[in-house]
Interface confidence: low
Amino acid sequence: QLTTESMPFNVAEGKEVLLLVHNLPQQLFGYSWYKGERVDGNRQIVGYAIGTQQATPGPANSGRETIYPNASLLIQNVTQNDTGFYTLQVIKSDLVNEEATGQFHVYPELPKPSISSNNSNPVEDKDAVAFTCEPETQDTTYLWWINNQSLPVSPRLQLSNGNRTLTLLSVTRNDTGPYECEIQNPVSANRSDPVTLNVTYGPDTPTISPSDTYYRPGANLSLSCYAASNPPAQYSWLINGTFQQSTQELFIPNITVNNSGSYTCHANNSVTGCNRTTVKTIIVTELSPVVAKPQIKASKTTVTGDKDSVNLTCSTNDTGISIRWFFKNQSLPSSERMKLSQGNTTLSINPVKREDAGTYWCEVFNPISKNQSDPIMLNVNYNALPQENGLSPG
């Protein structure tokens, strides 16, 4: 049976396509190509007579067509208007006709897309942002990438307008991007330049460091304030409610007991209009506030090596203190298997190994005094491997 095949089926605009013919009968008088799904003299592209080897252009000939003796038709510099069906009519020597229809689709070479946004400086937890991938083109697939990854399933991410528009509901500071859109059709793909969002947020509640409360007279008091904010926060300091200075750092040399009091850091974001404050009590004293002896507890004191994990907890009722851990007079953590958490109150060892056996204790301290817990002993056992058939393991 006479058939025709398009090579390729999907063609890029400006390229060429070859309509191949299979199972061409013997004893031919000639053949003719037509635009469309049927034989229509008004839409003839070209006719070919075998005897004279003469090709005759038809009404639908554009000058870009070449017919070959094997009946294949080459169309060069294709346009989107060339998309569609093509019919070959073969006139056999007995003047009985056979027909076959093929088709191909012409797609444009896609341009580099760009991203437009309705709001490039959104406010956190307040604004929504709609990104649109330009241009809008037919027969095009739109894809979006955030941080070079495809879109996660999220109630705050919505696609609309045939995936051409990506909307972020209630943006957060983590939504800065970059965002890219990609357009695809069967013959080409192109990705936009990345776009980032400048999400305005904060300030969050400021943190005053260091965390120490107690200071000796004559020491230098150096406090630093930080609040996550975009744009960066403006800071000011108040002591006992009285404004001091508009800086992020507060430095008072050679302090006396008169410098005891409430130290307030005020953070302001002029764009969001939000303010946050944190108050810290500073006590300057000759007296040593004695830190109470901490309690140490273990989730278990006898464990199996290379299998079990253990948590050691250091408990204290004192505030404004720091905690450190010791094992065989060494400061911890000493390996990647040891992790401190919850303000250093918990020491986790996972997994426990033979070398972790021994005495542990914790120490609580403030700038003026410190105290140690009683030691706790951790025993590490190794289970003997089961033996089979009287053979030694390994």
């Epitope: 937890d125 929504a128 399933v153 109630p155 919505q158 609309s160 307008n161 045939g162 909307t167 209630s170």
Partner: antibody, heavy 124, light 107 residues
Framework: EVQLLESGGGLVQPGGSLRLSCAAS????????MNWVRLTPGKGLEWVSV????????YYADSVKGRFTVSRDNSKNTLYLQMNSLRVEDTAIYYC?????????????????WGQGALVTVSS | EIVMTQSPATLSVSPGERATLSCRAS??????LAWYQQKPGQAPRLLIY???TRATGIPARFSGSGSGTEFTLTISSLQSEDFAVYYC?????????FGPGTKVDIK
């Protein structure tokens, strides 16, 4: 006018299967995420699953994960819920729910339009 | 998953009185919270979304407030058609979750 019409409910034995359908009309179906929500006598409303407009993204409540599968045929404007390994506690009225068309210019996934519900009874 | 709780479980109110329903989330859901009304034999009806925005066609006597973890639905003057079960639902994080509901009945 937005319309949602569920079908496929009925009586099924524990361990059995059932497939619910929801025919949608009155809005551009492919543009919107769709939800299944159920009403049980003891627990009230319980969100079951969601599927993104294209069908590529799905999410399930823990109680049905691994047993229920949500899908959609955008050419038919139809949403489906395939329910396998059904349990007595799955007995409920099942609603499909679509979001409101626009909120502040953006599409969200709360249920503004609801079907009339399909009763699923799991009993031996 | 985010757990939603509602209080009270039942609220008995006389027609014309004010009703205040509470909803609490186990973690912050920003303002991504909706309120629904459901009557026996009917599908739920969206009243409020975005914690405080009334859905199309909802009377002004219904109002919502709150953000983060604490939310309130207020019916300023109860009408006879308002006696129903009211549910809150968070849509900030998958899986979406409903509260157990508050039944408002006639005193």
């Amino acid at each position: 006018e937005v319309q949602l019409l569920e079908s496929g409910g009925g009586l099924v034995q524990p361990g059995g299967s059932l497939r619910l359908s929801c025919a949608a009309s009155g809005f551009t179906f492919i543009n919107y995420a769709m939800n299944w929500v159920r009403l049980t006598p003891g627990k009230g409303l319980e969100w079951v699953s969601v599927i993104s407009g294209s069908g590529s993204g799905t999410y399930y409540a823990d109680s049905v994960k691994g047993r229920f599968t949500v899908s959609r045929d955008n050419s038919k404007n139809t949403l489906y819920l395939q329910m396998n390994s059904l349990r007595v506690e799955d007995t409920a009225i099942y609603y499909c729910a679509s979001p409101p068309p626009m909120v502040r210019g953006v599409i969200i996934t709360i249920g503004n339009y609801w079907g009339q519900g399909a009763l699923v009874t799991v009993s031996s | 998953e985010i757990v939603m709780t509602q209080s009270p479980a039942t609220l008995s109110v006389s027609p014309g009185e004010r009703a205040t329903l509470s909803c609490r989330a186990s973690q912050s859901v920003s303002v991504n919270l909706a309120w629904y009304q459901q009557k026996p034999g009917q599908a739920p009806r969206l009243l409020i979304y975005g914690a405080s925005t009334r859905a199309t066609g909802i009377p002004a006597r219904f109002s919502g407030s709150g953000s983060g973890t604490e939310f309130t639905l207020t019916i300023s003057s109860l009408q006879s058609e308002d006696f129903a079960v009211y549910y809150c639902q968070q849509y900030n994080n998958w899986p979406f979750t409903f509260g157990p509901g508050t039944k408002v009945d006639i005193k």
